[in-house]
């Protein structure tokens, strides 16, 4: 796959994932009433990060915002924070990646700068996706814990006319937003990884290594740390091999103006 395609696809995948993270964060159905023990309910409850809703069989839906900060569970606050951090990082990642796209020309920005920006946006997307996945997973864990706790206390007997009066406790299970969040976080993460891979392709083959050139009797030997690799040239017409160190060029490359690099 070409760098442009990998970068472009990574951007699109991240963008879709990012949109999903926003959608999941805004959705009201993070937890929905478990109907297993009361399938005939005429009132259906569901909750989001920002408000809880009740849908009646009449079709009317009433939602109430959580107008308190101090009274909310710490876990819910943490999930909110993670999702918001994910969105903020995603926004920054998108802005950076737009400028980093190889298919978009902005002034005299060279490929080295684009490579760095691609890597930056890739990392931002990866962190954004991880934030979303962690946030959704924390909420899901909270639901599972509460579900089993309420199952243990499902029915409380109260003395009433004719014996026991049943009080059914409302239990909550996974809502659609959790699945949207997991998928969206995964897509953002994958898109970020693709951007990072594209970044490697934007940089020439040996850009990741500091190199020292030794010129002796018409031959050029490049020594690289992390494994010996040499390039030799014989004869007066042999050009010195081009070696990059963060974009700096060797002294003999004035005739070489490559339009393409070897892809990693």
């Amino acid at each position: 796959m070409s760098v442009t395609a990998c970068q472009g696809l990574g951007f699109v995948v991240s963008l879709i994932g990012f949109a999903g993270i926003i959608a999941a964060t805004c959705m009201d159905q993070w937890s929905t009433q478990d109907l297993y023990n009361n399938p005939v309910t005429a009132v259906f409850n569901y909750q989001g990060l920002w408000r809880s809703c009740v849908r009646e069989s009449s079709g009317f839906t009433e939602c109430r915002g959580y107008f308190t900060l101090l009274g909310l569970p710490a876990m819910l606050q943490a999930v909110r924070a993670l999702m918001i951090v994910g969105i903020v990082l995603g926004v920054i990642g998108i802005l950076v990646s737009i400028f980093a796209l190889k298919c978009i020309r902005i002034g005299s920005m060279d490929d080295s700068a684009k490579a760095k920006m691609t890597l930056t946006s890739g990392i931002l997307f990866i962190i954004s996706g991880i934030c979303a996945i962690i946030g959704v997973s924390v909420f899901a864990n909270m639901l599972v814990t509460n579900f089993w706790m309420s199952t243990a206390n499902m029915y409380s007997g109260m003395g009433g006319m004719g014996g026991m009066v049943q009080t059914v406790q409302t239990r909550y299970t996974f809502g659609a937003a959790l699945f949207v969040g997991w998928v969206a976080g995964g897509l953002t993460l994958i898109g970020g990884v693709m951007m990072c891979i594209a970044c490697r392709g934007l940089t020439p083959d040996d850009s990741n290594f500091k190199a020292v050139s030794y010129h002796a009797s018409g031959q050029n030997v490049a020594y690289r740390p992390g494994g010996f690799k040499a390039s030799t040239g014989f004869g007066s017409n042999t050009r010195n091999k081009k070696i990059y160190d963060g974009g700096a060029r060797t002294e003999d490359d004035e005739q070489s103006h490559p339009t393409k690099y070897d892809y990693v």
């Epitope: 009433q33 005939v40 005429a42 009132v43 569901y46 009646e56 009449s58 079709g59 009080t167």
Partner: antibody
Framework: EVQLQESGPELVKPGASVKMSCKAS????????IHWVKQKPGQGLEWIGY????????KYNEKFKGRATLTSDKSSSTAYMEFSSLTSEDSAVYYC???????????WGQGTSVTVSS | DIVMTQSPSSLTVTAGEKVTMNCKSS????????????LTWYQQKPGQPPKLLIY???TRESGVPDRFTGSGSGTDFTLTISSVQAEDLAVYYC?????????FGSGTKLEIK
């Protein structure tokens, strides 16, 4: 003004079927669910089921499932209830009612009197 | 099914008196999601269809005189008429709106002396 106009009284033979109607006016028919309630002479109220005119989806009280069929027609803003295999126990007044906020039936039809007699 | 039990079955009062009637459900009608009780009160006058008085256990329907008050939570509910009028002669029904099938109480018949 919201109105639910029910069809006239019916005199039917045991084992036969009857189809009664409930014509809604004064509001958007598809926005509200229509419920059906049975009341035997001098007795209490019994819920039969409902029809959602928007989806045409019915829900029945298990007691009446299989004998009551609830339908609706959006074009004429009318809900229908067909009752089959009638017995003397089915002699009653049948009301249609509109469900509103709080799952409360805020508007009721005048009722359709069904008498099952041989 | 939720069983609704109303008491007393009949009441005879004089005009201007305060009346209280009770309704008990076999299961809590309180919805934790909005902290509302899904119980409705209806008034049925002779030869007429029922009329909605109170929903959500205590919310008065528009047009209903303020002498009608609903109260209670969970499984125990009360309808109070602060000062009975002659036109209040009717049967009063409570109804479970919380789960299907919707069930009605057997009714409380209010008679005026």
């Amino acid at each position: 003004e919201v109105q639910l106009q029910e069809s006239g009284p019916e005199l039917v033979k045991p084992g036969a079927s009857v189809k009664m109607s409930c014509k809604a006016s004064g509001y958007t028919f598809t926005n509200y669910i229509i419920h059906w309630v049975k009341q035997k002479p001098g007795q209490g109220l019994e819920w039969i089921g409902y029809i959602n005119p928007y989806t045409d989806g019915p829900k029945y009280n298990e007691k009446f499932k299989g004998r009551a069929t609830l339908t609706s027609d959006k074009s004429s803003s009318t809900a229908y209830m067909e009752f089959s295999s009638l017995t003397s126990e089915d002699s009653a007044v049948y009301y249609c009612a509109r469900l509103n906020r709080g799952n409360a039936m805020d508007y009721w039809g005048q009722g359709t009197s069904v008498t099952v007699s041989s | 099914d939720i069983v609704m039990t109303q008491s007393p079955s009949s009441l005879t009062v004089t005009a201007g008196e305060k009346v209280t009637m009770n309704c008990k459900s076999s299961q809590s009608l309180l919805n934790s999601g909005n902290q509302k009780n899904y119980l409705t009160w209806y008034q049925q006058k002779p030869g007429q269809p029922p009329k909605l008085l109170i929903y959500w256990a205590s919310t008065r329907e528009s047009g209903v005189p303020d002498r009608f008050t609903g109260s209670g939570s969970g499984t125990d509910f009360t309808l109070t008429i602060s000062s009975v009028q002659a036109e209040d002669l009717a049967v009063y029904y409570c109804q479970n709106d919380y789960s299907f099938p919707f069930t009605f109480g057997s009714g409380t018949k209010l008679e005026i002396k």
